[in-house]
């Protein structure tokens, strides 16, 4: 069962001092959204017992495993049902506390009633303030039964529930017809899913025989021990003032557990702490009584004394619950209350006993849950005890449950039950995940979801080349870390599988499904060097390089040229996809820019060493375009072009370039230089008659500038075919003067 306790402080003189605390002994409980799951929840449950709305209650978290509810302002705030929810996943458990008003008309003789399936439950409401009206019983907030006020027996109204079944569980209340619901007696009925002493899906399994008022859980057969007791069968008392499944918690305050109600997971319910009783858990046990609610009687024999917290304290020479067993009677010693083994293992179980006469090998036996009796294979006899060793046949899941070691001698007999948990080794449900790869290594995330039982103690990664029949290589890793598989072959597929283990012998699970992981190509090792470069324009650069000569095939798929523009902080990458290439033309560069240039060989996604860098300065871009270009036919073979100089020139123009093209023609255009840059007019000669031509021009300073607009003009007449255009130029002013 989940180690969850709801504590109610019942010192009710001042409701503002009232508090409820939920304490979890589960590992990592209440931490919220981390790996341990949801936090502890503590709240008032208004679904069944509704009370008038009041100020909101205050919830305070104290560390990771405790939560406290405060802020009660008036007694009516306390009345009703409170619940604490803790544990994660399938172990999520709700613990319920029902609070009754001490001033109610009717009070429960006993709040929590835990009964077995098929039993008769009797709820008893004691008259505290009499009213001569009907008494209405409700179940989970709905009408259930009516009693005439004359039907009270010894000042009590009884509700008999014969042959109860699990759906009968819930909150019951008894209310006088004309009274406020806050004056009701509230009860909690818990109906175990099985008959007395049985548990399991078909109620076929036998309970371990819980001691000291512990209640056998109908789902898992574990004893839910009263506060103040521990052990598989609740056989051991905690020190005074301690509680929790391992006695690890301590009652707050100087008066220990006085005035506290303890609520534990069903089917236990609620009770006072060990040594206390009464509706407010403030009365110490009467002599001869002990335990939670003082329900247990000591009946100590042989001079034993009754301790109200732990029961009989036996004098030397005696032991047993009532000090009824002489130390001469054989006694099982130091038997673990719980053992864990892995499925299909054949463990050895030891059982030690002492007594007079001394136990021998044949007097100690081991009984499995199905009733099979095992006899010991060997015994170690020491002066103070005999230890029998049992070789257990291969374990199956059905072996989970309560085993019993029994010793019998002529002096008497003793037995000790202990729980055996058969765990299923974990088996991965998925393949491991590839995180990164290189040519000779793979980085893998090995921990995947798994079937079977945790915790995971080790993770083994098995790998070998795909389609290989060689032995698997194995690496053992920490469950929480990623694994690097080293010294692999490049460009090779590897089959990779995970094997998980849990603690203990035989904890290794089956291998998980395989996955294919492929290493990268080998890194290219050759370093090219730059042979040279040639500027082919303000934005074009031709680069050439070489590689060292080495024997064997070239490891590479191509080259990567990188140009770094340090001024702008920009990198240009050019991919040359042939490993045979030794030259490349880079276009679209920025004129006037200083570039750092290098080249690298690449293979798959891997880059080899870069060449030593070269520094290249591209010439700046040319001047702006000439303005107002105009064409005028002079004859059947001549056209005059006029223009204006470009504006905002960065320097003196060295020449103009005119482009001549026959309109609609398919041939290349003709470029004609105008070498006298001061001129603004030129005559293009040698043109064909009656032919339409396109013209545009640009200036040059250190580099060619932008093209002007294109103009069209046709030559005159129908003269002879010319040899081709030529140019004659003069200043525009001269032409105008003429």
């Amino acid at each position: 069962a989940v180690d969850l306790t709801l504590l109610a402080n019942l010192r009710l003189t001042d409701p503002q001092r009232f508090f409820l605390t939920c304490v979890s002994g589960e590992a990592g409980a209440g931490r919220g959204s981390d790996a341990w799951g949801p936090p502890l929840l503590l709240e008032k449950d208004d679904r069944i017992v509704r009370t008038p709305p009041g100020p909101p209650l205050r919830l305070a978290r104290n560390g990771s495993h405790q939560v406290t509810l405060r802020g009660f302002s008036k007694p009516s705030d306390l009345v009703g049902v409170f619940s604490c929810v803790g544990g994660a996943g399938a172990r999520r458990t709700r613990v319920i506390y029902v609070h009754n008003s001490p001033g109610a008309h009717l009070l429960p003789d006993k709040v929590t009633h835990t009964v077995n399936k098929g039993d008769t439950a009797v709820l008893s409401a004691r008259v505290h303030k009499e009213k001569q009206t009907d008494v209405i019983w409700k179940s989970n907030g709905s009408y259930f039964y009516t009693l005439d006020w004359h039907e009270a027996q010894d000042g009590r109204f009884l509700l008999q529930l014969p042959n109860v079944q699990p759906p009968s569980s819930g909150i019951y209340s008894a209310t006088y017809l004309e009274a406020s619901p806050l004056g009701s007696a509230f009860f909690r009925l818990i109906v175990r899913g099985c008959g007395a002493g049985r548990w399991g899906p078909g109620c076929t399994k036998e309970c371990p025989g819980c001691l000291h008022g512990g209640v056998c859980h109908d789902h898992d057969g574990e004893c839910v021990c009263p506060p103040g007791f521990t052990g598989t069968r609740c056989e051991q008392a905690c020190r005074e003032g301690r509680f929790g499944q391992s006695c690890q918690e301590q009652c707050p305050g100087i008066s220990g557990c006085r005035g506290l109600t303890f609520c534990l997971p069903d089917p236990y319910g609620c009770s006072c702490g060990s040594g206390w009783r009464g509706s407010q858990c403030q009365e110490a046990c009467a002599p001869g009584h002990f335990g939670a609610d003082c329900r247990l009687q000591c009946q100590c024999q042989n001079g034993g004394t009754c301790d109200r917290f732990s029961g009989c304290v036996c004098p030397s020479g005696w032991h047993g619950v009532h000090c009824e067993k002489s130390d001469r009677i054989p006694q099982i010693l130091n038997m673990a209350s719980e053992l864990e083994f892995n499925l299909e293992t054949m463990p050895r179980i030891n059982c030690a006993a002492a007594g007079n006469p001394f136990p021998v090998r044949g007097s100690i036996e081991l009984r499995k849950p199905d009733g099979t009796v095992l006899l010991s294979t060997k015994a170690i006899v020491e002066p103070e005890k005999t230890t029998a060793e049992f070789e257990v046949p291969r374990l199956v899941l059905a072996d989970s449950g309560f085993w019993e070691c029994r010793v019998s001698t002529s002096g008497g007999q003793d037995s000790r039950r202990f729980k055996v948990n058969v765990k299923v080794p974990p088996v991965p449900l998925a393949a491991p995940r590839l995180l990164t790869k290189q040519s000779r290594q793979l980085v893998v995330s090995p921990l995947v979801s798994f079937s079977g039982d945790g915790p995971i103690s080790t993770v083994r990664l098995h790998y070998r080349p795909q389609d290989s029949t060689m032995d698997w290589s194995t690496i053992v890793v920490d469950p929480s870390e990623n694994v690097t598989l080293m010294n692999l072959r490049p460009k090779t597929g590897y089959s990779v599988r995970v094997q998980l283990s849990r603690p203990g012998e035989g904890g290794e699970g089956a291998w998980g499904p395989p996955t294919l992981m492929t290493t990268d190509c080998p890194e290219p090792l050759l370093q090219p060097w730059l042979e040279g470069w040639h500027v082919e324009g303000t934005d074009r650069l031709r680069v050439s390089w070489s590689l060292p000569l080495v024997p064997g095939p070239l490891v590479g798929d191509g080259f990567l040229l990188r140009l770094w523009d340090g001024t702008r902080g920009q990198e240009r990458r050019e991919n040359v996809s042939s490993p045979q290439a030794r030259t490349a033309l880079l276009t679209g560069l920025t004129p006037g820019t200083h570039y750092q240039l290098d080249v690298q060989l690449y293979h798959c996604t891997l880059l080899g060493p870069a060449s030593p860098p070269a520094h290249v300065l591209l010439p700046p871009s040319g001047p702006p375009a000439p303005r107002h270009l105009h064409a005028q036919a002079l004859s059947d073979s001549e056209i005059q072009l006029t223009w204006k100089h470009p504006e905002a020139l960065p320097g003196p123009i060295s020449k103009y370039v005119v482009e001549v093209q026959v309109a609609g023609g398919a041939g290349d255009p003709l470029w004609i230089d105008v070498d006298r840059p001061e001129e603004t007019s030129t005559i293009i000669r040698g043109l064909n008659a009656s032919t339409r031509y396109l013209f545009r021009m640009r200036a040059s300073i250190q580099g060619l500038g932008d093209w002007s607009n294109t103009v069209e003009e046709s030559t005159l007449g129908n003269g002879l075919q010319a040899e081709g255009p030529v140019q004659e130029s003069r200043a525009a002013e001269e032409g105008l003067d003429q």
């Epitope: 409700k138 009516t146 009693l147 005439d148 039907e151 619901p181």
Partner: antibody, heavy 127, light 110 residues
Framework: EVQLLESGGGLVQPGGSLRLSCAAS????????MKWVRQAPGKGLEWVSV????????GYADSVKGRFTISRDNSKNTLYLQMNSLRAEDTAVYYC????????????????????WGQGTLVTVSS | QSVLTQPDSVSGSPGESITISCTGS?????????VSWYQQHPGKAPKLLLY???YRPSGISGRFSGSKSGDTASLTISGLRTEDEADYYC??????????FGSGTKVTVL
């Protein structure tokens, strides 16, 4: 579905006896308080008798006290009204009804109401 | 036991509101004793309309409402409809084992 079915009515002479039955189904009869209510021809409703779930507590209208006896058999889910020393003024349609208790607001007391009625059985007392 | 006093008849036109009174004493209506109201159509069994003076069981129209002042309880039917034409009875308890009905009121929809 909750059903109440009265039977046993008929013509009887003054001073005679009659036993009415009310068969209940569709609910846990043994948990509910039950009542008999009658209605004389052309007149209003008149409460006759009440019985608690256990059968231990009963009550009667003054007009029938000492002559009528209410009882129940929870194992048979049946309510009875034994009518002795019948008079002409006992002529009426006799209804059995279930008492339910309602939780009006959740904060206040619970309140009763006759939530299911039978179709009635006619008792005629005449010579 | 004395019968609770109701008017013999009350009438109203469709859509109107009508109120039926039910007068008792401090032993019944005026005490902390639960008043309930029932509707009975001719030839049919009665049907619970209101319990604890003002509360409607599920399935009962919100047109029916109740109130109480002193020894008198009242049933109001708003937005009167033709199907509301029936006899109406109030009821109360006297102690735990004694009960009383009203004399009944015939409601006519004009």
């Amino acid at each position: 579905e909750v059903q109440l079915l009265e039977s046993g009515g008929g013509l009887v002479q003054p001073g005679g006896s009659l036993r009415l039955s009310c068969a209940a189904s569709g609910f846990t009869f043994s948990r509910y308080k039950m009542k008999w209510v009658r209605q004389a021809p052309g007149k209003g409703l008149e409460w006759v008798s009440v019985i608690y779930p256990s059968g231990g507590g009963t009550g009667y209208a003054d007009s029938v006290k000492g002559r009528f006896t209410i009882s129940r058999d929870n194992s048979k889910n049946t309510l009875y009204l034994q009518m002795n020393s019948l008079r002409a003024e006992d002529t009426a349609v006799y209804y059995c009804a279930r008492v339910n208790y309602y939780d009006s607001s959740g904060y206040g007391p619970i309140a009763p109401g006759l939530d299911y009625w039978g179709q009635g059985t006619l008792v005629t007392v005449s010579s | 036991q004395s019968v609770l006093t109701q008017p013999d008849s009350v009438s109203g036109s469709p859509g109107e509101s009508i109120t039926i009174s039910c007068t008792g004493s401090s032993r019944d209506v005026g005490g902390y004793n639960y008043v309930s109201w029932y509707q009975q159509h001719p030839g049919k069994a009665p049907k619970l309309l209101l319990y604890d003076v003002t509360y409607r069981p599920s399935g009962i129209s919100g047109r029916f409402s109740g109130s109480k002042s002193g020894d008198t309880a009242s049933l109001t039917i708003s937005g009167l409809r033709t199907e509301d034409e029936a006899d109406y009875y109030c009821s109360s308890s006297i102690g735990t084992r004694t009960y009383v009905f009203g004399s009944g009121t015939k409601v006519t929809v004009l």
